[in-house]
């Protein structure tokens, strides 16, 4: 019916408008509507100036798309001609009175389907479905994946590729790991994964400055040092450094008028020369304060060597020894006077005889034929040495013995000389003068060793070799190398080292091969004025301890191995040190302070003398320890 | 739409051969990846076999309890994948899926064609 | 080889209860995947990379795990949801699947 009548409107507008000119009257006669009608007519009026005679030619010049008047009166009721729709949104247009309709193609919206719907901003359908990226797209959308992702299927959901899997040579020689949207080349610690190479490298974290004082990369990792031997240790942050500090204080103070006679390990502390009148005789006077058993006092000879006297200690007594022309004497005698305490000693010629005695109290005589020395132009010359003799006397005394003396004299008074001069020489030489007070043991101040040769095998045991070590040990501060066995090649397959515990106060001991910690016992408090006990037993098999708490044998996986490596260098051939070590690397052991305190050593039934080493730093003191410092009332 | 669908199955001898063909469409063929899995009440899902796309050279990988009896082969150019099966055993009985795979997993799966070996 | 044991082999649940179901794996990986399968149809992968869920999958599922241990949850069971599912990953060039969980409506 409609179209009945659209077609019925056509004709009458052909009839009253195209074949004849029509008013806006007649025109509203064939629409019938006022809508339509204002619509038409104006339009009309524009088609007929544009074909009105004379202009015909002119406006198909023109930008008229009519080619005739007919055409162009036709068209203008239908308002989807020229099409309202945007051309890519709309479906169909559809022509109404006066108006449009255009529908649009899904994704379009808008009178003329001109706008586009933002399909990725849809409330109803977050991110339009997609599980990534929403794309828009001019009346569409798409969904796309971020790098290292795969679409599936169903065009919405993006998946993870698995790098890994995918390609498994894409890392080389390093762990691949698979994380979303991308891989890792996963190196062990202390390694960097290399793209050229696609394999790890160590990090050189030496180069990167890691440690305070001394570092040592190796395969993994790094390991810092601080130098013991000036006093420092590694720090808990295992990067810095930090002083050993004392954990408990000793009374170092010393007095000029006293000479220490171990200053040096080697050699004579004090050497004096006296040219006196002939009717001189030899004297000496002294207090004497020792807890050593044997070494010089003092020995004096003739100018010309010829006659000497030697006043020694042996087995904590006073010996004798003298030769000169008319004789050749060795006298032992007295009281042991090795007990710390201070002893008047005095030796004096006598026309007849020696006289020794000690605390006033004659001890022995020594006959003699003539004079002790010989004087010669009318002078007696006598040299005297305090705490050894030249060396070439060694091979002419009577009986040998092992010059080495830890003790101080003091009041001395030689070839009835008094003190003169000596004291003034004394003075100026700090490591001449003597600790005030001390007790029994040795001393090690922190600052050097000593080196013993031990012979730990035991042909008669099936384990070959075995070291039995009891320490009697006052530290004076926490962490320092009290006993290490070292190879030819500069490694230490054994010490025992102490260090301050990770707890207040308290200090651990570290039983070590190489560089390894075979095991550690802590926590114990080490650092006070009483001796602590500590017992090891090592043989190729066991390692046996006690402390002052428990007595345990050691085993664990490891220490067999370990164990191993200790045994193959006992084979061959060890040197002993106490108190610290030698110039072996840092990273030859887990400490390399020297150790600070006091401490006897007893190895294999043997109690170790210092005075017996094959070296020893001058600061050892082998029989006399600093007493703990006492914090008085005024200090 | 991405659709796969299996043909050729069927009831063979033990000791015999058989051809599964698959055709699919709705998606970009020579980029994938296409493998076959089975289903038996016995086994449950079983992978069988895995052809990858041009790029990855036309790759194949199989599963242990196939490798030597079974052949996976694609045409790029009718996007069809085959399974060719000698050797057939009873335990290889079943419903054989083609899918597509997509990185790793199985992303679209065919309604699947029956394999009866007996005797 | 890597072996997928998926427990337990068959649970019933009531609708709107909690319901979870494991896959063990004996040896770590990095994904897992989740396949529904209804009577008479094929398998859907429903779960993929250890918990994202296919497009148009509910959201009262969800898949979580890693290493050797991995599990499919829902939150409320529906009628709908009573399927068996199976578990599924890869590793050295091999698929592997689980035997599968048959979750039945009370």
């Known amino acids: 019916a409609n179209s009945l009548l659209e077609e019925t409107k056509q004709g009458n507008l052909e009839r009253e408008c195209i074949e004849e000119l029509c008013n806006k009257e007649e025109a509203r006669e064939v629409f019938e509507n006022d809508p339509e009608t204002d619509y038409f007519y104006p339009k009309y009026l524009v088609c007929l100036r544009s074909f009105q005679t004379g202009l015909f030619t002119a406006a198909r010049q023109s930008t008229n798309a009519y080619p005739d008047l007919r055409s162009c009166v036709n068209a203008i009721p239908d308002q989807c001609s020229p099409l309202p729709c945007n051309e890519d949104g709309y479906m169909s247009c559809k022509d109404g009175k006066a108006s449009f309709t255009c529908t649009c193609k899904p994704g379009w919206q808008g009178e003329k389907c001109e706008f586009d719907i933002n399909e990725c901003k849809d409330p109803s359908n977050i991110n339009g479905g997609c599980s990534q990226i929403c794309d828009n797209t001019p009346g569409s959308y798409h969904c796309s994946c971020k790098n290292g992702f795969v679409m599936l299927s169903n065009k919405k959901d993006c998946k993870d590729v698995d790098e890994c899997s995918l390609k498994p040579s894409i890392c080389g020689t390093a762990v691949c790991k698979n994380i979303p949207g991308d891989f890792e080349c996963e190196c062990p610690e202390g390694y960097r994964y290399n793209l050229k190479s696609k394999s790890c490298e160590d990090i050189d974290e030496c180069s990167e400055n890691m440690c305070a004082q001394l570092c040592v990369n190796y395969p993994g990792g790094y390991t810092c040092y601080c130098d013991g031997k000036k006093g420092f240790k590694l720090a808990q942050d295992q990067k810095s450094c930090e002083v050993v500090s004392v954990c408990l204080p000793l009374n170092l103070d010393t007095k000029y008028e006293l000479l220490y006679l171990a200053e040096q390990f080697a050699g004579v502390v004090l050497y004096l020369k006296f040219r006196l009148p002939e009717i001189s005789r030899f004297s000496a006077e002294f207090d004497f304060r020792t807890y050593d058993s044997e070494g010089v006092i003092l020995y004096a000879e003739s100018i010309d060597h010829s006659a000497w006297l030697l006043i020694a200690l042996r087995g904590g007594k006073i010996e004798v020894q003298l030769k000169n022309e008319h004789t050749s004497k060795i006298t032992t005698g007295g009281d042991v006077i090795n007990n710390g305490l201070w002893n008047m000693v005095s030796v004096e010629e006598l026309e007849h005889s020696i006289s020794i005695k000690i605390a006033k109290e004659a001890v022995m005589d020594i006959n003699k034929p003539g004079p002790l020395f010989k004087p010669e132009n009318g002078l007696l010359e006598t040299k005297v040495y305090f705490a050894g003799f030249p060396r070439k006397v060694e091979s002419e005394l009577i009986k040998p013995i092992n010059p080495r003396l830890d003790g101080c004299i003091r009041s001395w008074n030689l070839m009835k000389q008094g003190a003169s001069g000596i004291k003034e020489i004394i003075q100026e030489k700090q490591n001449k003068h003597c600790l005030v007070t001390v007790e029994k043991g040795s001393y090690y101040p922190g600052s050097g060793i000593a080196q013993f040769h031990i012979d730990y095998n035991n042909v008669s045991s099936a384990e070959g070799w075995h070291v039995n070590v009891t320490l009697n040990i006052r530290p004076s501060t926490g962490t320092g190398v009290m006993l290490a066995l070292v190879s030819g090649n500069n490694t230490v397959p054994f010490a025992v080292s102490l260090v301050d515990s990770t707890s207040e106060k308290s200090q651990d001991i570290l039983l070590s091969v190489e560089n390894t910690v075979i095991y550690r016992i802590q926590a114990l408090s080490l650092c006070s004025d009483q001796q602590s006990h500590l017992e090891f037993r090592v043989n190729r098999n066991n390692l046996e301890l006690s402390t002052p708490l428990k007595i345990e044998t050691i085993s664990h996986e490891d220490l067999q191995r370990q164990l191993a490596v200790l045994d193959k260098a006992m084979k061959a051939k060890v040197a002993t040190y106490l108190g610290g070590l030698p110039d072996v690397p840092f990273s030859a052991t887990p400490v390399n302070a020297f150790y600070n305190g006091c401490m006897e050593v007893n190895i294999n039934g043997v109690q170790l003398d210092l005075d017996e080493a094959i070296s020893k730093h001058n600061d050892i003191r082998a029989h006399s320890c600093p007493s703990v410092w006492k914090k008085t009332k005024n200090s | 739409e991405v659709k796969l669908e299996e043909s050729g199955g069927g009831l063979v001898q033990p000791g015999g051969s058989m051809k599964l063909s698959c055709a699919a469409s709705g998606f970009t063929f020579s980029d994938a990846w296409m493998d076959w899995v089975r289903q038996s009440p016995e086994k449950g899902l079983e992978w069988v076999a895995e052809?990858?796309?041009?790029?990855?050279?036309?790759?194949?990988y199989y599963a242990e309890s196939v490798k030597g009896r079974f052949t996976i082969s694609r045409d790029d150019s009718k996007s069809a994948v085959y399974l060719q099966m000698n050797s057939l055993r009873p335990e290889d009985t079943g419903i054989y899926y083609c899918t597509l795979t997509t990185a790793f997993l199985f992303d679209s799966w065919g309604q699947g064609t029956t394999l009866t070996v007996s005797s | 080889q890597i072996a997928l044991t998926q427990s337990p082999a068959i649970m019933s649940a009531s609708p709107g209860e909690k319901v979870t179901m494991t896959c063990s794996v004996n040896?770590?990986?990095?994904?897992m995947h989740w396949y529904q399968q209804k009577p008479g149809s094929s398998p859907r992968l429903w779960i993929y990379d250890t918990s994202n869920l296919v497009s148009g999958v509910p959201g009262r599922f969800s898949g979580s795990g890693s290493g050797t241990s991995y599990s499919l949850t829902l939150s409320s069971m529906e009628a709908e949801d009573a399927a068996t599912y199976y578990c599924?990953?890869?590793?050295?060039?091999?698929?592997?699947f689980g035997g599968g969980t048959k979750l039945e409506i009370k």
């Open positions: 040896s770590s990986v990095s994904y």
């Open positions: 052809v990858r796309s041009k790029a990855d050279n036309h790759a194949t």
């Open positions: 599924q990953q890869y590793s050295g060039y091999l698929y592997t």
